[in-house]
């Protein structure tokens, strides 16, 4: 049974041509966790597997950065970054949890950080 | 070319250290994680440690038959990776290869690793 | 630590003959972090096969590679005189890195 969950960012905004840290939490559970994907839509960002580490795809290569711990740093912001961004972790024996942020690149100066939200 | 290039090694005593180099070329050093693999006289092969790229900071991991006495380090300014070798023992007398390791995700997210550059080797002795 | 166990230890074989290796783990292992090398006297081992199928670079299609699991295969179709060696298989996740103690495939 499934009994974790993940704690993400939730909703958040950052300006155009600066950086944000994308951030999940898996908790309540004892599995181990054996890789964290990082995707937007259906392209993939990033992968940390337990035993090998990081592995950033050659297309974000120079904007993605790995962590802090399992999270990711996107850097060099533009307005196509805005959508949908998931933190898919692999455990074992539970199987996978994944976490949703949504980002907003906005054009202004003004970015708010929305509230933290948990999915089951 | 793809390249790697072993040297350092020699005979030394029980108890000695040396360090080992291996000169890499034809390839963007700081992308690869480089793993160090020996094997004794006769022998199989056995995987020493590794050091990973610079996503990684470059963190190291070794083989429990090595931890705490060998230590991986690279400079990717001179496109070199060293093993220094401390606390020798005999069972240490091998030849020692640098390798390329390959870590990527294909297609569904399926990983890799493997070795697909191997350097020629140099020989260690361990002997009184 | 994962143990791969190859067998046979020594294959004795003509040119011509096929060829199976066989390389098992301890426990189960993802197959696409296995990989087969050969290694001829004197020289560096040379990477065949990863992800345990797929062939590396500039090998011969008569080299194939299967198995999930806890079996994998190494398969030569037809041996040719440069093929006798030692080959060894690898598995890399989970740490630590290990290898088969490998086969040596000789000639009859």
């Known amino acids: 049974m499934m009994t974790g969950t993940i704690e993400t960012t939730g909703n958040i905004s950052a300006e155009k041509g600066g950086s944000i840290i994308l951030q999940c939490h898996l908790s309540s559970t004892t599995a181990q966790v054996t890789q964290v994907n990082w995707e937007q839509q259906d392209q993939l960002l990033a992968i940390c597997n337990a035993d090998l580490g990081w592995h950033i795809s050659p297309s974000f290569k120079d904007r993605v950065a790995p962590g802090p711990g399992l999270g990711l740093t996107l850097q060099s912001l533009t307005v196509n970054d805005t959508g949908e961004y998931f933190c898919i972790y692999h455990t074992y024996p539970d199987g996978t949890y994944t976490g949703r942020i949504f980002l907003e690149v906005l054009e202004s100066s003004v970015a708010e950080h929305g509230a933290r939200f948990q999915i089951p | 070319e793809v390249q790697l290039v072993e040297s350092g090694g020699g005979l030394v005593q029980p108890g000695g250290s040396l360090r080992l180099s291996c000169a890499a070329s034809g390839f963007t050093f700081s992308d690869h994680y480089m793993d160090w693999v020996r094997q004794a006289p006769g022998k199989g092969l056995e995987w020493v440690g590794r050091t990973r790229n610079k996503a990684n900071s470059y963190t190291t991991e070794y083989a429990a038959s090595v931890k705490g006495r060998f230590t991986i380090s690279r400079d990717d300014s001179k496109n070199s990776l060293y093993l220094q070798m401390n606390s020798l023992k005999t069972e240490d007398t091998a030849v020692y290869y640098c390798?390329?390791?390959?870590?990527?995700?294909?297609?569904?997210?399926?990983?890799?690793?493997?070795?697909?550059?191997w350097g020629q080797g140099t020989t260690v002795t361990v002997s009184s | 630590e994962i143990v791969l166990t190859q067998s046979p230890g020594t294959l004795s074989l003509s040119p011509g003959e096929r060829a199976t290796l066989s390389c098992r783990a301890s426990?189960?292992?993802?197959?696409?972090?296995l990989a087969w090398y050969q290694q001829k006297p004197g020289q560096a081992p040379r990477l065949l096969i990863y992800g345990a199928s797929s062939r590396a670079t500039g090998i011969p299609d008569r080299f194939s590679g299967s198995g999930s699991g806890t079996d994998f295969t190494l398969t030569i179709s037809r041996l040719e005189p440069e093929d006798f060696a030692v080959y060894y298989c690898q598995q890399a996740v989970p740490s630590p890195l290990t290898f088969g103690g490998g086969t040596k495939v000789e000639i009859k």
């Open positions: 426990q189960s292992v993802s197959s696409s972090y």
């Open positions: 390798a390329r390791g390959q870590y990527y995700y294909g297609s569904s997210s399926r990983g890799y690793y493997y070795m697909d550059v």
